[in-house]
């Protein structure tokens, strides 16, 4: 049966071949593959200023393949399309558009931004943050006690982090002045010796508005162990009025 | 949008022609093999017949086969089923749709009934 | 002609279930397969195509499965929006055949 389908093949195309290649079912010198074995694809190879038949198991980059009842051939994707399952539904784009619904567009739609890793278009994701925490105690240089106007700060933290077009987050920091009833410090919540506080300059890289570190008292009583000379004190209290500042961070 | 609106349905005897016509918009319509899937009341569905991009070559299903003809206007952007010799079990909905390995898009369909 | 042929042919389930339908081809079909989702007086719509491919706005809870001649649609978790008609199709070969259907109901 083969055979006499090879003659009358043979009739129509002087130079068909019985010893073709591959998968070819029928082919001819010049032309090469003009039908397929079972199951593989034909396609036309563009070979310097003719077209080639040949027979594949899968169609090559940019075609797809499509079973009909006398031929399985390679279909060509859209222009812009790189791989697809069919001519509806592209699976990956040419350089310079983006996969959406299955289509290549060279500029994703309203709502959408453009992922260039994936290259393809994706929703816009938006900051989100959780609800404040509580305030925190109210402190002046880490201490809860000897003084009467200090800080407290809450924290929130960022649930979702925004893609490259949402909405940048909020702060997620908040500092504000507060006022405690004075209360004197007991004896294990001793300030650093003076020495120690006498630190003047901020470290490098340290901001001048930054609440102060070290360890400095307003108790109503004086103990010996907390006494100052009256000039540091004043001065000390200039200092701290200054320095009182709300800081957010913004991320 | 892709819409494919279909028409020309309705009660005809048994033995007798109908033509069905599906209106393509939203793609272009040249490009793409089209097909008719009918689906008998209560059942599941059916291919009946394709037609390539440009007109070149059909494909039925065995049971319409020298009864039905596809063909298609790419000018107006228009499918056709010519019914021919209809019989009481061709009685179902009839859709036309895009036909690429899977049938990707649908019209609503339009009811055919077979009935002396 | 391959047949297709599905199971069950209909199926009762609660929102929340998960649920799976099965598909049946008499020849080794590849992964030629797709599945289709109709609901009453309506076009079907597809949803997967090459056994697993998802169409795009296609819920992440379809999925599909196997190859050859035996492959699932599972559903994980079932909305009130998937009760309708399934449809198994082949397009390994023509004619490009339909399984019967499966009908997923509400309990």
């Known amino acids: 049966q083969n055979a006499s389908r090879g003659r009358r093949q043979r009739r129509m195309h002087p130079n068909v071949s019985q010893g073709c290649q591959g998968g070819c079912a029928t082919c001819s010198d010049y032309n090469g593959c003009l039908s397929c074995k079972p199951r593989l694809f034909f396609a036309l190879e563009r070979i310097g200023m003719k077209q080639i038949g040949v027979c594949l198991s899968s169609c090559p980059s940019g075609y797809y393949g499509t079973r009909y009842p006398d031929i399985n051939k390679c279909t060509k994707c859209k222009a812009d399309c790189d791989t697809c399952f069919n001519k509806n539904f592209c699976t990956k784009c040419k350089s310079g558009f983006y996969l959406h619904l299955g289509k290549c567009l060279d500029n994703c739609p309203e709502g959408l931004e453009a992922n260039n890793h994936t290259m393809e278009c994706v929703s816009i994701v938006h900051c989100e943050v959780s609800e404040w925490n509580p305030w925190s105690p109210c402190t002046k240089k880490g201490k809860t006690c000897g003084f009467k106007r200090g800080t407290e700060t809450r924290v929130r933290e960022i649930i979702q982090h925004p893609s490259a077009k949402g909405n940048l987050c909020p702060p997620t920091n908040e500092t504000r002045k507060c006022t405690v009833q004075r209360k004197k410090c007991q004896k294990g919540e001793r300030g650093k010796k003076g020495r120690e506080r006498k630190r003047k300059k901020p470290n490098k890289g340290e901001s001048k508005e930054a609440i102060p570190d070290s360890k400095s008292l307003e108790s109503s009583k004086e103990i010996p162990e907390q006494r100052e000379n009256k000039q540091q004190q004043k001065k000390r209290k200039v200092q701290d009025k200054q320095k009182s500042v709300s800081v957010s961070t913004v991320h | 949008e892709v819409q494919l609106v279909e028409s020309g349905g309705g009660v005809v005897q048994p033995g007798r022609s109908l033509r069905l016509s599906c209106a393509a918009s939203?793609?272009?319509?040249?490009?793409?093999?089209m097909a008719w899937v009918r689906q008998a009341p209560g059942k599941g569905l059916e291919w009946v017949a394709t037609?390539?991009?440009?007109?070149?070559?059909?494909y039925y299903r065995d049971s319409v086969k020298g009864r039905f003809t596809i063909s298609r206007d790419n000018s107006k952007n228009t499918l056709y089923l010519q019914m021919n010799s209809l019989r009481a079990e061709d009685t179902a909905v009839y859709y036309c749709?895009?036909?690429?390995?899977?049938?990707?898009?649908w019209g609503q369909g339009t009811m055919v009934t077979v009935s002396s | 002609d391959i047949q297709m042929t599905q199971s069950p042919s209909s199926l009762s389930a609660s929102v929340g279930d998960r649920v799976t339908i099965t598909c049946r081809a008499s020849?080794?079909?590849?992964?030629?397969l797709a599945w289709y989702q109709q609901k009453p007086g309506k076009s079907p719509k597809l949803l997967i195509y090459?056994?697993?491919s998802l169409i795009h706005g296609v819920p992440s809870r379809f999925s599909g499965s196997g190859s050859g001649t035996d492959f699932t649609l599972t559903i994980s978790s079932l909305q009130p929006e998937d009760f309708a008609t399934y449809f198994c199709?082949?397009?390994?070969?023509?004619?490009?055949?339909f399984g019967q259907g499966t009908k997923l109901e509400i309990k």
């Open positions: 090459d056994v697993n």
């Open positions: 939203g793609f272009t319509f040249s490009d793409y093999d």
């Open positions: 020849e080794d079909i590849y992964s030629d």
């Open positions: 199709q082949q397009y390994d070969n023509y004619p490009n055949t």
């Open positions: 749709a895009t036909h690429d390995k899977t049938f990707d898009y």
């Open positions: 037609i390539i991009y440009d007109g070149s070559r059909t």
